[in-house]
């Protein structure tokens, strides 16, 4: 084959299902609360994907707070099977792991990671800074957690349950009761309100995933995160999709889901592509 022929192999886009997220509190930032005690606690850091120490003030805060490192790991890291044990025995990678890396139409030379289905490994690539697809991770660790196979022939799925490639048996890591809910909204709906770094006092709304409601907060005018809406209605539209409750035998009960499927898909495309 000539180089010209190879050059004209055009990589096309693919429709993707929504990404399912578990344990919303593991995505919260460490919150020391308004009180002034000095208490050593642990929280799960979504950026390093590890449990880390922080100082808790003794009141309020959020659910991403644990008495011990072990408890934090049990609840939030992939070694823990405090997650749903899937009933299916098929491969557990999300569909977007099989997309080609896509730098997007901009050119910003941002280092990102994608899962290469040929090499079966996460690899570095240069992301342009806009658009692209969901096979796009800020860290190698994040890419590996979601798309790579685990050690010893085990496939580690998104929820931490291991699938033994030899005898197709599910191997949970713990006997703790699994979480009963999956959050199906955009990932930023799980993050706490973030004022940002500037000095303005703009009236905004954020989704409080602990209470399941949109609440007002004061935005500084720059920075912050995507859990930031100009109206309560917009906040509810984006985040109040409800939870899906699991029952035994892997069944699902839908509790509330308002938005159309395609809109949800778009929201998920944004999760990986844009958290810079």
């Amino acid at each position: 084959d000539s180089e010209e022929d190879e050059e004209h192999t055009i990589i096309t886009d693919t429709e993707l299902p929504p990404l399912k997220l578990m344990h919303s509190f593991c995505a919260f930032k460490a919150d020391d609360g308004p009180c002034k005690a000095i208490m050593k606690r642990f929280f799960f850091n979504i950026f390093t994907r590890q449990c880390e120490e922080f100082i808790y003030g003794g009141c309020e805060g959020n659910q991403n707070r644990f008495e011990s490192l072990e408890e934090c790991k049990k609840m939030c890291t992939r070694d823990n099977a405090n997650r749903i044990i899937k009933t299916t025995l098929q491969q557990e990678k999300p569909d977007f792991c099989f997309l080609e890396e896509d730098p997007g139409i901009c050119r910003g030379y941002i280092t990102r990671y994608f899962y290469n289905n040929q090499t079966k490994q996460c690899e570095r690539f240069k992301y342009g800074g806009c658009l692209g697809n969901m096979n796009n991770f800020e860290t190698l660790e994040e890419c590996k957690n979601i798309c790579e196979d685990g050690p010893n022939g085990f496939q580690v799925d998104n929820y931490g349950t291991q699938l033994n490639a030899v005898n197709n048996s599910l191997t949970p890591q713990s006997t703790k009761v699994p979480s009963l809910f999956e959050f199906h909204g955009p990932s930023w709906c799980l993050t706490p309100a973030d004022r940002g770094l500037c000095r303005a006092n703009e009236n905004r709304f954020y989704y409080n995933s602990v209470i399941g409601k949109c609440r007002p907060f004061k935005y500084s005018g720059c920075g912050g995160n995507e859990n930031n809406f100009t109206s309560k209605q917009e906040c509810l539209r984006a985040c109040k999709k409800g939870f899906i409750q699991r029952i035994s035998k892997g069944g699902l009960i839908k509790t509330k889901r308002k938005r159309k499927k395609q809109r949800v898909k778009i929201a998920y495309e944004e999760i990986f592509v844009k958290n810079m």
Partner: antibody, heavy 123, light 112 residues
Amino acid sequence: QVQLQQSGPGLVKPSQTLSLTCAISGDSVSSDSAAWSWIRQSPGRGLEWLGIIYKRSKWYNRYAVSVKSRITINPDTSKNQFSLQLNSVTPEDTAVYYCARWHSDKMWGFDDWGQGTLVTVSS
Amino acid sequence: DIVMTQSPLSLPVTPGEPASISCRSSQSLVFSRGNTYLNWYLQKPGQSPQLLIYKGSNRASGVPDRFSGSGSGTDFTLKISRVEAEDVGVYYCQQYDSYPLTFGQGTKVEIK
């Protein structure tokens, strides 16, 4: 100075294929600092983005869902141009079709446009 | 799809006076490394559109400094500090936050 020169028929019969070409001067279709797009404009729909191609380590494309099953955008590196093919056209596809360059470097946007081609779909 | 809504749809202006066009997106156009995924274009009568403002607030080359873009999240504004006769035409906002790329329906600026 980048220039985009469009060519192709102005009249297409329903159910046939609309084919337009955009010749590029002052840049390369294979440039890694550009992307190449087709956009159409009609009174009913306003400006409607149809699709885009771009070359980085390989060629990529993206198409609007509204035309995805009917559209193909291809580069022609030997002639430094790219083309639009829209199959199974209906009168709804009547519009002015523009090719445009997306500037991928510092200035992210459609910074150069072709002159536009009015395509009428009618028997 | 992200829906871009412009207002007003028609804007009669007096030369030398300021003018302002609003563009609202149905989803937040994410700030990323200081970038807003929104552009403004002007289509003069009988011509193809031309890029005016990129990344929300940056003037494209050759665009006079009387044009300025601002806004973040879902609300954006294009301002002309002093309208000139050559500024007449239809102004469009466009997002590139997610596919498909979408444009506003346009604001027609004409001299009173």
